[in-house]
Every structure is written in structure tokens, then in C-alpha cells.
């Protein structure tokens, strides 16, 4: 039973670490300018990004990521592997 408890705790801890590393990954993408910056201009390198600015880019990268995930789900449902399962469910309605 103690092993099970440890397993559950480890799983929860791993999920937290995964979320943190995903956040770090997004931040590293932002730091490298992947996906384009929001406030792009000729004098971009004149001064470091303000926190609010970097938060804005982080949010933009995250929203792009969420959008891509939503599109992937849509494609799977209407053109891909989830379509057949949905057809079966439609038949049950």
C-alpha cells in the first residue's frame, strides 16, 4: 500500500515537473524568438524586453501552441484516426 502511495506521489510529482519543463521549453522558444515576436521593429535590440513584454510573448506562444493542439484534434476527428470511433458513436445516438 505504501508503494502504491509512493507511486501516486511520484506520478503527481512527474506531472508537475512535466508542466514546469513545458513552460521552460516555451520560454526558451521565446528567448530564441521562435514563432516571431509580438513587438518586432527596427530597434528591437536597443533594450531588453520588459517583463510585461516577455509575458506577452510567452502568452502568444502558448496560445499558438493551444491553437495547434486544437487544430490537431479537429484533424484527427474529421480526417483521421478518431473519425471511425466517432462514426460508431453517431450510430448509437
Amino acid at each position: 500500500r505504501r508503494d502504491v502511495a509512493h507511486g501516486i506521489l511520484n506520478e503527481a510529482y512527474r506531472k508537475v515537473l512535466d508542466q514546469l519543463s513545458a513552460g521552460k521549453h516555451l520560454q526558451s522558444l521565446v528567448a530564441r524568438g521562435v514563432g516571431g515576436s509580438l513587438g518586432g521593429g527596427a530597434g528591437d535590440d536597443a533594450e531588453p524586453l520588459s517583463k510585461r513584454h516577455s509575458d506577452g510573448i510567452f502568452t502568444d506562444s502558448y496560445s499558438r501552441y493551444r491553437k495547434q493542439m486544437a487544430v490537431k484534434k479537429y484533424l484527427a476527428a474529421v480526417l483521421g484516426k478518431r473519425y471511425k470511433q466517432r462514426v460508431k458513436n453517431k450510430g448509437r445516438r
Epitope: Q68, A70, V71, K72, Y74, L75, A76, A77, V78, L79, G80, K81, Y83, R86, V87, N89, R93
Partner: antibody, heavy 108, light 109 residues
Framework: SVEESGGRLVTPGTPLTLTCTVS????????MSWVRQAPGKGLEWIGF?????SAYYATWAKGRFTISKTSTTVDLKITSPTTEDTATYFC??????WGPGTLVTVSS | AAVLTQTPSPVSAAVGGTVSISCQSS???????LAWFQQKPGQPPKFLIY???KLASGVPSRFKGSGSGTQFTLTISDVQCDDAGTYYC??????????FGGGTEVVVK
Amino acid sequence: SVEESGGRLVTPGTPLTLTCTVSGIDLSSYYMSWVRQAPGKGLEWIGFIDTDGSAYYATWAKGRFTISKTSTTVDLKITSPTTEDTATYFCARDLDLWGPGTLVTVSS
Amino acid sequence: AAVLTQTPSPVSAAVGGTVSISCQSSESVYSNYLAWFQQKPGQPPKFLIYEASKLASGVPSRFKGSGSGTQFTLTISDVQCDDAGTYYCAGGYSSEGVAFGGGTEVVVK
């Protein structure tokens, strides 16, 4: 079933909303897509609305269209129509059940 | 943006014969999420094949989809008069959604 309505002759720049009415379809379980077809031309995907009501658009369609829904209808608003928007507009559940389409003509 | 290029129209087929239509994508189709549709004049498109090779419900096994990555083919064997129409491929792209090919008209003689 799926059926589109609202198509008509409009002048350029006059916003127009098309409505897709569904029956026997739970819109909280299915994606709804909009596709258009200019006279004598091919199919063009506009975008879709998610089960939770979030809308996503083709790159070319962003800002030109708005998709929204209620429990039994899905709307497509053409924000500022141009003559290039003259087409038959189709609504589809997923992409396997399509309505007959509604014709929009944009002309001055 | 991704571009899907189909076999130029029209393509002729004899009743009982075989016809193939190609669909080439300018970039790789996400997870081979490619579909084929049939459309007849004055009607909405009909869903035939999904995920490149899987038959949609109620579609005769005479229709066969194949291919992967950027190159896909729809083959209709034992062609019937009712198969006349325009066929469209549609590819899924994770960054931009769905793109349709330009369509290929099949004429049955």
C-alpha cells in the same frame, strides 16, 4: 441534418451572416466546418468551430469571417464582403455530413 | 500555405475500367490525414475516404485510397456511370487546418 440559410445578394462592404441549422446533432460533441465554392471553382476551407465554441480559421480567412454558435445553430459572418466572396457556402458536421449550401452574391 | 495539386481535368474512364487520380501536397500532410470527396453538379461534396486509405461508411470497396507524406492516389476500379463527377482531395496541416485540391473531373464513357 444540416441546412444553411441567409445567402442573398449584397453590396460590397455590407456584413452578412449565414446560419447553419442542425437537427439531431449535439453541437457540444461535434466540430462544425464552413467551406465555400465560387461558381465553377473548387472547394475552399474557411474554418471550424470547436465543441467548446472556440473558432479557428484558414490563414486567408482570418479577420474576414467570424464563426459562432448556439445550441442548434452555427453562424458564419462575412465581415466585409467583396466580389471575391461570391460563392456557395457549405456547413458540415465534421466533414462527413454536409448541407445543400446557400448562395451568396456580392455585387454593386 | 500548403498547396494540393491534383491530376488535371477531365479524366476519362470506360464503364468497368479503372481510373486513378493523383494528389500531390507541397508539404507533408499531418499524420496522413488526407481525405477524398466526390461532388456532382448542384450537390454538396460526399465524403469517400479518410486517413489516406480508409473507406467512409457506405462507400463501395471499388474506391481505394493510397499514398503517404506528400503523394496520394484515389483509384476507382470497375467504374460505374454513377462515378462521374468531380473528385477533391483534402489534406490536414497542423499549423493551418485543411486545404483542398483543385478538383479532378471524371467523365465516364
